[in-house]
Interface confidence: low
């Protein structure tokens, strides 16, 4: 470990000089010190903080033959391509024994054309909608005055007279370019040119015009689109199952949406091929030659219930004396809603029709009058939802039941060769 110098005696005999110049300059700062005994490692500080990744070299030369004699140590810090981040106060620091020594400071400064800290960025804005652009530049030398330009035309009579760091634009009706000039005593620097693309405003008042079990008719009010006419609007619909979690402003649907395009005008669209009695979320965006508007918020809608599309399946009807036992299964065809129950009708050859509401049961025992004297008795069954009755089954004749015989089953719906749905096995 370093033995250190005599108390209170600074080891520094040469301190960092000053460097001032334009960006890109290369320069070197040096510290020289004389110590007794093993030379210490020289650390470089910039503004009091150690530079961990400094491009520094250290040269050590003994002044005598004895290890305990004095040494001259020269540390050189190279600054390549001077940048704003390099500016500040530079010092060298060494630890000797129980003391800490800091060199006198040298300063690195920057002076030249204005340097942009922030430039206007390309962006899209809705037509006639206010927005702000930012531009920030600094020297040295200060002051730096800004001049904004729109489509290459200055927005003020002279630098520093108009808006400075932030330009407020009350709205645009056509795609425009913006840039800013930074002026100081050394000259002028021009920022990048930002293109502000004017898109249509978000459509408003998306609403339902009419509803049917498998289709919805929707309409909306288009927003302003500047000088660019709307070319079309796009409507998205997505199933909104309970677990889906679409929020009012959620930007993307959690599953692939059903997308339809509408020619405009009119600002209206019929969405077909939907599931009955199903909640959806819909949204709309309109497009001009400049691009699409933002989407509206998701609007929750629901298709109404329909009636079942087919009759109950596998109806069997058997008779035993004055009783008839009728059994059936739920329709295979879509219910188009919530099944509320079944209606059953039976009729003899010369007797009036009897209509019964069975509820959600799938079997019923009928008490027949006249101990079987009613001839050619037939039974029909239909399923119903809140929207009404589905189609009735074909009439099923009542068959006499003989012990030991299986109950006859009347297959009223022909099985498709390939199942329409593939159900999992539990």
């Amino acid at each position: 470990a370093p033995r250190g110098t005599q108390a209170e005696e600074s080891p520094f005999v040469g301190n960092p000089g000053n460097i001032t110049g334009a960006r890109g300059l290369t320069g070197t700062l040096r510290c020289q010190l004389q110590v007794q005994g093993e030379p210490p490692e020289v650390h470089w500080l910039r503004d009091g903080q150690i530079l961990e990744l400094a491009d520094s070299t250290q040269t050590q030369v003994p002044l005598g033959e004895d290890e305990q004699d004095d040494w001259i140590v020269v540390s050189q810090l190279r600054i390549t391509s001077l940048q704003l981040s390099d500016t500040g106060q530079y010092q060298c620091l060494v630890f000797l024994g129980h003391q800490t020594f800091v060199s006198q400071p040298g300063y690195v400064g920057l002076e030249g054309l204005p340097y942009f800290l922030e430039e206007p960025e390309d962006r899209t804005v809705a037509a006639n909608t206010p927005f702000n652009l930012s531009c920030q530049a600094q020297g040295p030398p200060e002051p730096v005055d800004l001049l904004w330009l729109q489509d290459a035309v200055p927005l003020a009579t002279a630098p520093g007279h108009g808006p400075q760091r932030s330009l407020h634009v009350p709205g645009l009706n056509k795609t425009s370019s913006f840039s800013c000039e930074a002026h100081n005593a050394k000259g002028v620097t021009t920022s990048r040119t930002a293109t502000i693309t004017v898109l249509p405003q978000q459509p408003r008042n998306l609403h339902l015009v009419s509803r049917q079990p498998t289709e919805l008719e929707v309409a909306w009010t288009p927003g302003l689109s500047g000088i660019y006419p709307l070319t079309h609007c796009t409507l998205q619909a997505v199933l909104s199952d309970d677990g889906m979690g679409i929020q009012a402003g959620e930007p993307d649907p959690p599953e692939e949406p059903l997308t339809s395009q509408a020619s405009v005008p009119p600002h209206q669209l019929r969405l077909g091929s939907l599931h009955p009695h199903t909640p959806y979320h819909i949204r709309v965006a309109c497009t001009s030659s400049q691009g699409p508007s933002s989407w509206t918020h998701w609007l929750p809608v629901e298709t109404p219930e329909g009636v079942p599309l087919g009759p109950p399946e596998n109806i069997s009807a058997t008779r035993n004396g004055s009783q008839a036992f009728v059994h059936w299964q739920e329709p295979r065809a879509p219910l188009q809603g919530t099944l509320l129950g079944y209606r059953l009708a039976y009729q003899g050859q010369d007797t009036p029709e009897v209509l019964m509401d069975i509820g959600l049961r799938q079997e019923v025992t009928l008490e027949l009058q006249g101990d079987g004297s009613v001839s050619n008795l037939t039974v029909c069954v239909a399923a119903y939802t809140a929207a009404g009755d589905g189609p009735w089954s074909l009439p099923v004749p009542l068959e006499a039941w003989r012990p030991g015989q299986a109950q006859p089953v009347h297959q009223l719906v022909k099985e498709p060769s390939t199942p329409a749905f593939s159900w999992p096995w539990w």
Partner: antibody
């Protein structure tokens, strides 16, 4: 905003040990040094020592060496001053102070002070 | 250790007066001297460092000068808020040392 908040006043008997804390916020705790200074009632300022929290390196005033320990806990941005074998003459206001960026030996932000009273 | 000798130890002055406080180092400390202001019941406040650089937010009526061993703090026009005790400090090498203080009182 740089803030240095010190622990509360202490009353100790001669020979005892006291440990006071200084919690900092508003700047990088490890990027600077923390100095400790004391001021006996009605008297001037006396430098005790410093610590560089990034590496735990310390420098002490030889006058107090052996009785003083300066430490830091980077995880909670807190510096500590521990003083043992207290004497009545150690009664003073003890300050922590942040080392200035242009010199570690400059104190640009100070804590509110912790009064340590040593009395039998 | 470096000794910092401050004078005067106290002075009386009126609002608007020009006030000068001096500090002498026992050895060459280059320009590594700072000045602090302390009011009763408060922690010291940094005014000047590197002999002549004003700290952030310090009014321009405070100025410092000197190098080597002799240093001066000047208050060009004393204000009511300036009545306090002033300390010099060398920030050249450890152990850091302070002057004994100068109390500026209202005449």
């Amino acid at each position: 905003e740089v803030q240095l908040v010190q622990s509360g006043a202490e009353v100790k008997k001669p020979g005892a040990t006291v440990k006071i804390s200084c919690k900092v916020s508003g700047y990088s705790f490890t990027g600077h040094t923390m100095n400790w200074i004391r001021q006996p009632p009605g008297k001037g300022l006396e430098w005790i020592g410093l610590i560089k929290p990034s590496n735990g390196g310390t420098s002490y005033n030889q006058k107090f060496k052996g009785r003083v320990t300066i430490s830091a806990d980077k995880s909670i941005s807190t510096a500590y001053l521990q003083w043992s074998s207290l004497k009545a003459s150690d009664t003073a206001m003890y300050y922590c102070a942040h080392g200035h960026y242009e010199s570690y030996f400059l104190m640009d932000y100070w804590g509110q002070g912790t009064l340590v009273t040593v009395s039998s | 250790d470096i000794q910092m000798t401050q004078s005067p130890s106290s002075l009386s002055a009126s609002v608007g007066d020009r006030v000068t406080i001096t500090c002498k180092a026992s050895q060459d400390v280059s320009s590594a001297v700072a000045w602090y202001q302390q009011k009763p019941g408060q922690a010291p406040r940094l005014l000047i460092y590197w002999a002549s650089t004003r700290h952030t937010g310090v009014p321009s009526r405070f100025s410092g000068s000197g190098s080597g061993t002799e240093f001066t703090l000047t208050i060009s026009s004393l204000q009511p808020d300036d009545f306090a005790t002033y300390y010099c400090q060398e920030h050249f090498s450890t152990p850091l040392t302070f002057g004994q203080g100068t109390k500026v009182e209202i005449k």
